[in-house]
Amino acid sequence: PRSIDVKYIGVKSAYVSYDVQKRTIYLNITNTLNITNNNYYSVEVENITAQVQFSKTVIGKARLNNITIIGPLDMKQIDYTVPTVIAEEMSYMYDFCTLISIKVHNIVLMMQVTVTTTYFGHSEQISQERYQYVDCGRNTTYQLGQSEYLNVLQPQQ
């Protein structure tokens, strides 16, 4: 068998909401993956498990099952969303994310993803992890790959 390549592209969008009383931030983060099948037979993307960390603390998890089948020598782009919560011992972040004196409230999140593929009863897992900048101050859509670099982060409204 030839390789199945998984490439984490980046954050596609981040939608934010707050609970003022609880000083809690809710971020729905949609990420994009490219999965390439270099084989001459189809492979099934059985599941994608993802988690997001902030300051070494897991703030969100997601799992997608029975996602798609990728044909021979084909590539598919897959979006997945991880709901995250920044609260409790990290509730000081509410002050940062709601500061009116700054335009872009970038925080650094560690995106971790594991893709499980199957073919002919054989299962394979591929994992990736990447630090990404996300604006916790407003709803943001990003050009693909943009969220990896702070100096180009001009969020599109």
């Epitope: 409790e88 011992e89 000081y92 940062f96 650094v108 900048y133 702070l150």
Partner: antibody, heavy 117, light 107 residues
Framework: QVQLQQSGAELVKPGASVKMSCKAS????????IEWMKQNHGKSLEWIGN????????KYNEKFKGKATLTVEKSSSTVYLELSRLTSDDSAVYYC??????????WGQGTSVTVSS | DIQMTQSPASLSVSVGETVTITCRAS??????LGWYHQKQGKSPQLLVF???NLADGVPSRFSGSGSGTQYSLKINSLQSEDFGTYYC?????????FGGGTKLEIK
């Protein structure tokens, strides 16, 4: 307004211990970690450790493990730094500060510790 | 531990001049960097947090920039109250460490 009030200067003998305080006011005490720094005269700053009143989580710089102990009195919103087995190397100004994302935004006025026989 | 290398160590400048202080981290600190100003006998004061954001009450002549391992603090049109020592500090992973400081003196 946010304030961190530190206890007064200390003159202590070698081998003894000293306990200094940092009283927080003007904000919800359990929300922000409190950091402690050491500054030798005319030198840069060294991070000793931090204490998060939300869950009593304490982190220390390896260099200060066994030397520094952080404790809390939540009823008075006060964090304490105790230094043990003092030597002349411990003579310095000790600062507490409030942690914020990407910086320490409020600082106490500092506590001067002089170790001398 | 992450090392913070700050330069220059000292600087002699006149009022009205522009100054840039740089800080290099031994590894990527993902913009988790603060800049502080300290006057003799006083506590440090936060100027810039998260590499680029001006703290409350800090004049707009101060600005922070950088990413990855390279960061800088720029002071436009220096005022007499700006003299003193400047420190950078990373807050990426404990132990937080400070740069060695830049002493700004009046020429």
């Amino acid at each position: 307004q946010v304030q961190l009030q530190q206890s007064g200067a200390e003159l202590v003998k070698p081998g003894a211990s000293v306990k200094m305080s940092c009283k927080a006011s003007g904000y919800t005490f359990t929300t922000f970690p409190i950091e402690w720094m050491k500054q030798n005269h005319g030198k840069s700053l060294e991070w000793i450790g931090n204490f998060h009143p939300y869950n009593d989580d304490t982190k220390y710089n390896e260099k200060f493990k066994g030397k520094a102990t952080l404790t809390v009195e939540k009823s008075s919103s006060t964090v304490y730094l105790e230094l043990s087995r003092l030597t002349s190397d411990d003579s310095a100004v000790y600062y507490c500060a409030r942690y914020f994302y990407g910086g320490m935004d409020y600082w106490g006025q500092g506590t001067s510790v002089t170790v001398s026989s | 531990d992450i090392q913070m290398t700050q330069s220059p160590a000292s600087l002699s400048v006149s009022v009205g001049e522009t100054v840039t202080i740089t800080c290099r981290a031994s590894e990527n600190i993902y913009s988790s960097l603060g800049w502080y100003h300290q006057k003799q006998g006083k506590s440090p004061q936060l100027l810039v947090f998260a590499a680029t954001n001006l703290a409350d009450g800090v004049p707009s002549r101060f600005s922070g920039s950088g990413s990855g391992t390279q960061y800088s603090l720029k002071i436009n049109s220096l005022q007499s109250e700006d003299f003193g020592t400047y420190y950078c500090q990373h807050l990426w992973s404990v132990p937080w460490t400070f740069g060695g400081g830049t002493k700004l003196e009046i020429k």
